[in-house]
């Protein structure tokens, strides 16, 4: 197979015919050294998935349910290109499965038992698989056959295409359960009509169904959406209140050696030449031979799926949960409202060991999951492999953009017993230099810089945000002669100063000696000219407070702060000499786990928090000999957020604006994936 050939998998004679036409037309418009199409015919989409996994084909377009099959082992395929619908300016690659109710009803998602339900059709995504998959563990046992369990859960339903003889209750609202538009309650509009007419109490449809059926806002205002956290929202707020986000139609490829760049090059060229309204001879998004061949006829074009986005992230936690429940038919032994152990995400092996010790001391109420970077941990929380972790504000922003929520804040200044209910204002992000140097904020160009990590608040977002507004470009590695900013590209000058050891050089975790607040300060002590840290870093690592060899003889007076007005001040004066106020670190979790995490952590800190005085012979949650493992070592307590329970409210408008501005310089693959 030539290196530049993409072997497209076709699943019918008609698809194979269109594929050959696709191949011939691409050959006519692409240079000889460009990508080419080859066609492979298989009997079904599942056969195509297996063929791609076995390297007998390279690509196929799949519906969401099949993307799930493609991702499962041993297939291990991943999404590489998404079809989009709507306009190029506002491309839609996903739709949202929602539960719509009338505003004047008064039940929540966890009170659906005994209600009347309207579905688009048996086995359909938004109308059946997702809602029934998510409700699966609440269905009465035995849960097989599924239709019987659903019939016994709701007091009456309309499920088009169901067997009305065996399951009459599923057809109670639409006698016969007709499987076409002859049934007035069939498909999306039909299910909504079933609710509108008062036949049903809830309709399981797409987010767009309401808008397509009710042009008038006043009419739409008579309806609400049921959210998974047992609240309701207006029908406009479907992005924050849905059962699952469903990808429409996706090209998949192998995770390793999958030719994704070549596939994108091919499809990007294809949409330029043969996309909507581009050519009379061949049309990518229609065919005289049949409907939806190779691609959906309703598609308007393609978008490249960000490389960090694997199938789990692409399909989303709710969708995968629903489909897995339906397919595997397994439910937890504990009732769903009971808090299972909370899985903490630990960064690399140092944090993992502290987490394990916590796990033992919590008698297994805490379990541990590991990842090599903070972004990998956030991704694990998103997909349910982990539940929570504590994050610097810069990562609270990324986690928030990825759908996670802040749960508790680390407090550093408020003594107990008021600590748990106090909202602190934050800490100061400062620039530290040696007293012996002549540096000021205005002559940092060409100097050696030390950062906690890329994407973190005091070490990156605040100083680089300020720098960006001064230099108006993102080439920070050219501004400083060299530095250590863990998480930078390995060949960047901002990795040159890092200490490693070797395979971990410049990695954004504790394996890199210059990572974090203490690491950045150590970098200043040993190699650098300026360190961007929190205001407490110098006092916490001088005067013998840090017993490590590099720190034990350091004196506080040998370091000073740079002020934005060009002056310098003592490290004792951060209130009058700082770069900005930074939001405290905070614990984040998925919305569905937030209450559990909060309850458990408040309980854990009562046992292992700052009230424990002897940490040499007792487990202490907020102690790790200046290494800030799992939590900052200067944490006094974890505090309730009260109404600051979204990332925007928690971080504050000013900080969110600063980080959003810096996004044009973003090197965060996760942020790119979460904003896709």
């Amino acid at each position: 197979v030539p290196e530049k050939s993409v072997r497209w998998c076709a699943v019918s004679e008609h698809e194979a015919t269109k594929c050959q036409s696709f191949r011939d037309h691409m050959k006519s418009v692409l240079p000889s050294n460009g990508p080419s199409v080859a066609c492979v015919k298989k009997a079904s989409h599942l056969d195509c998935i297996r063929a791609i996994a076995a390297n007998e084909a390279d690509a196929v377009t799949l519906d969401a349910g099949l993307v799930y099959d493609a991702y499962l082992a041993p297939n291990n395929l991943k999404p590489v290109v998404a079809e989009f619908y709507g306009s190029k300016e506002d491309p839609q690659t996903f739709y949202y499965a929602v539960a719509v109710v009338k505003k004047d009803s008064d039940f929540q998602m966890n009170q659906l038992r005994g209600r009347k339900s309207c579905h688009t059709g048996l086995g359909r995504s938004a109308g059946w698989n997702i809602p029934i998959g998510l409700l699966y563990c609440d269905l009465p046992e035995p849960r097989k056959p599924l239709e019987k369990a659903v019939a016994n859960f709701f007091s009456g339903s309309c499920v088009p295409c169901a067997d009305g003889t065996d399951f009459p209750q599923l057809c109670q609202l639409c006698p016969g359960c007709g499987c076409s538009t002859l049934n007035q309650y069939f498909s999306y509009s039909g299910a909504f009509k079933c609710l509108k007419d008062g036949a049903g109490d809830v309709a399981f449809v797409k987010h767009s169904t309401i808008f397509e059926n009710l042009a008038n806002k006043a009419d739409r205002d008579q309806y609400e959406l049921l959210c998974l956290d047992n609240t309701r929202k207006s029908v406009d707020e479907y992005k924050d209140c849905h059962l699952a986000r469903v990808p429409s139609h996706t090209v998949v490829a192998r995770s390793v050696g999958g030719k994704e760049d070549l596939i994108w090059e091919l499809l990007n060229q294809a949409q330029e030449h043969f996309g909507k309204d581009k050519s009379k001879e061949f049309q990518l998004f229609s065919s005289p031979h049949g409907k939806d061949l190779l691609f959906k006829d309703s598609a308007h074009g393609f978008l490249k799926v960000p490389p960090r986005m694997d199938a789990k992230m692409y399909l989303g936690y709710e969708y995968i949960t629903a489909i897995r429940n339906l397919r595997e038919g397994t439910c937890p032994e504990a009732p769903t409202d009971e808090c299972k152990p909370v899985k903490w995400c630990a960064l690399s092996h140092h944090e993992r060991l502290k987490c394990d010790e916590w796990s033992v001391n919590s008698a297994g109420k805490i379990e541990c999951e590991s990842a090599e970077t903070t972004e990998d941990c956030i991704a694990k929380i998103m997909n349910g492999e982990a539940d929570a972790m504590s994050l610097d504000g810069g990562f609270v922003y990324i986690a928030g953009m990825c759908g996670l929520v802040p749960v508790l804040a680390e407090n550093y200044n408020t003594p107990n017993p008021n600590c748990e209910n106090t909202a602190e204002e934050g800490y100061f992000a400062v620039a530290v230099v040696k007293s012996s140097s002549d540096l000021t904020w205005d002559n940092l160009k060409g100097k050696k810089s030390c950062h906690t990590a890329v994407g973190r608040t005091a070490g990156w977002n605040i100083p680089m945000g300020l720098l960006y507004s001064k230099i108006n470009h993102c080439r920070f590695d050219e501004f400083f002669s060299e530095g250590c900013a863990p998480g930078s590209e390995k060949n960047s000058s901002l990795c040159k100063l890092c200490m490693g050891p070797s395979p971990n050089l410049c990695e954004p975790n504790n394996k890199e000696g210059y990572y974090g607040y203490t690491g950045a300060f150590r970098c200043l002590v040993e190699k650098g000219d300026v360190a961007f840290v929190k205001h407490q870093t110098v006092p916490q690592n001088t005067g013998g407070k840090n017993p490590d060899a590099w720190a034990k003889n350091l004196k506080e007076e040998d370091y000073e702060l740079l002020c934005l007005d060009g002056s310098r001040k003592s490290v004792q004066e951060p209130a009058n000499c700082h770069l900005a106020r930074a939001p405290n670190h905070a614990v984040v979790a998925r919305k569905d786990k937030a209450d559990c995490v909060q309850t458990l952590l408040l309980d854990q800190q009562r046992m292992f928090g700052s009230s424990v005085t002897d940490c040499s012979s007792n487990f202490c949650l907020f102690e790790s000999k200046t290494k800030d493992l799992l939590f900052r070592d200067d944490t006094v307590c974890l505090a309730k957020l009260h109404d600051r329970n979204t990332y925007e409210k928690y971080l504050g408008e000013e900080y969110v604006k600063a980080v959003t501005n810096l996004r044009k310089c973003s090197t965060s693959p996760l942020l790119e994936a979460c904003t896709f």
Partner: nanobody
């Protein structure tokens, strides 16, 4: 820092038992948490079982009901009783007091357990 020496490993048939011991050169009475870890070839080191000074224990899901951790403060020793051994339990087993391991990354020599017919 406390010096720890593991012993008691060996070759055993599936379904068999072994008792591992970990002797501390200092007093373990002042140490809070002790734990057994294992590392199979090409895999990450993983927590098997842990015990606090007050006797709170926790176990990895894969060993629950088969392994029992205990400690004898008077003898400065921690034990791991392993019953119903399976081939997948084959690994080098290490014990730790945590106080040194998560800062200096200090580990003893470990003791090899091989489960094979």
């Amino acid at each position: 820092q406390v010096q720890l020496v593991e012993s008691g490993g060996g070759l055993v048939q599936p379904g068999g038992s072994l008792r591992l011991s970990c002797a501390a050169s200092g007093s373990i009475f002042s140490i809070n948490t002790m734990a057994w870890y294992r590392q199979a070839p090409g895999k990450q080191r993983e927590l098997v079982a842990g015990i606090t000074r007050s006797g709170t224990t926790t176990y990895a899901g894969s060993v629950k009901g088969r392994f029992t951790i205990s400690r004898d403060n008077a003898k400065n020793t921690v034990y791991l009783q392993m019953n119903g051994l399976k081939p997948e339990d084959t690994a080098v087993y290490y014990c730790t007091d945590y106080s040194s391991s998560y800062y200096q990354d200090y580990w003893g020599q470990g003791t090899q357990v091989t489960v094979s017919s």
